[in-house]
Amino acid sequence: GPVPPSTALRELIEELVNITQNQKAPLCNGSMVWSINLTAGMYCAALESLINVSGCSAIEKTQRMLSGFCPHKVSAGQFSSLHVRDTKIEVAQFVKDLLLHLKKLFREGQFN
């Protein structure tokens, strides 16, 4: 069945922690992605950004999680208003920013 929101959030946080702790070489060869507004529709927005990174084994599980948690189909090259389209950041920074925000949401009990 569908993953409960609290479980989804916790699993995603755990995976992002794993990525940041195990990072040795530049994550995803230093690939750059669009920054996003960390507000409503965050799972989909994060996926729309990270889906444009290919061949990066370190974030494959994160992409799978976000794809499962986002209610609509997302394809590479697709963009929504949730992106800050003038700002590109490294995947490593994107992951750190997303992790900080998700931890905050989890502490506040905002699971959706």
Epitope: A25, N29, S31, V53, G55, A58, R64, S67, F69, S75
Partner: antibody
Framework: EVQLKESGPGLVAPGGSLSITCTVS????????INWVRQPPGKGLEWLGM???????DYNDALKSRLSISKDNSKSQVFLEMNSLRTDDTATYYC????????????WGQGTSVTVSS | DIVLTQSPASLAVSLGQRATISCRAS??????????MHWYQQKAGQPPKLLIY???NLESGVPARFSGSGSRTDFTLTIDPVQAEDAATYYC?????????FGGGTKLEIK
Amino acid sequence: EVQLKESGPGLVAPGGSLSITCTVSGFSLTDSSINWVRQPPGKGLEWLGMIWGDGRIDYNDALKSRLSISKDNSKSQVFLEMNSLRTDDTATYYCARDGYFPYAMDFWGQGTSVTVSS
Amino acid sequence: DIVLTQSPASLAVSLGQRATISCRASESVDSYGQSYMHWYQQKAGQPPKLLIYLASNLESGVPARFSGSGSRTDFTLTIDPVQAEDAATYYCQQNAEDSRTFGGGTKLEIK
């Protein structure tokens, strides 16, 4: 334009080793993954292994001990090496690129035919 | 490794009729609500061509007569209506696990 082209020895003796090169163009190996797949004459497809853009390598468990996959990003080349060859390793060997997530194989080379025979 | 079993091994379908190919996995290929099953078409003397990804999504440029369905362990590729150029062998493939696998293939003949 995305292209992949395999080049191999054609004929290899039993017990010998095989080295195949996949040369790609139209994309970078630093941010794309490459799979190796083989097909014996008249039979189905068998996944051998892959090398991710970031360098991680995954192998077919049954063939892991005989396989080695590597790449040279600057030359846009991926290499498959296989040792202790047997006659049932005779096949067409393909390299194939993973597309974006969910990482299905969206572009394939034409394949190179390898015969293991004395 | 996940074993994929395709059935039938071969089938003959009349032009304009429906062809249905089944792929059964030895264990679930679902992950976070998505099915990591893909379908390929291989014509004689050619490399395979991606048709469908994530069980039901049509690859760009593939005709709408091809469709995919299923989840967990049971998947179906449907071609309706079958055209003469669809004569080929069709393969399912999973990447739910790091070690990917293909089904044994189904050869489609057009009557």
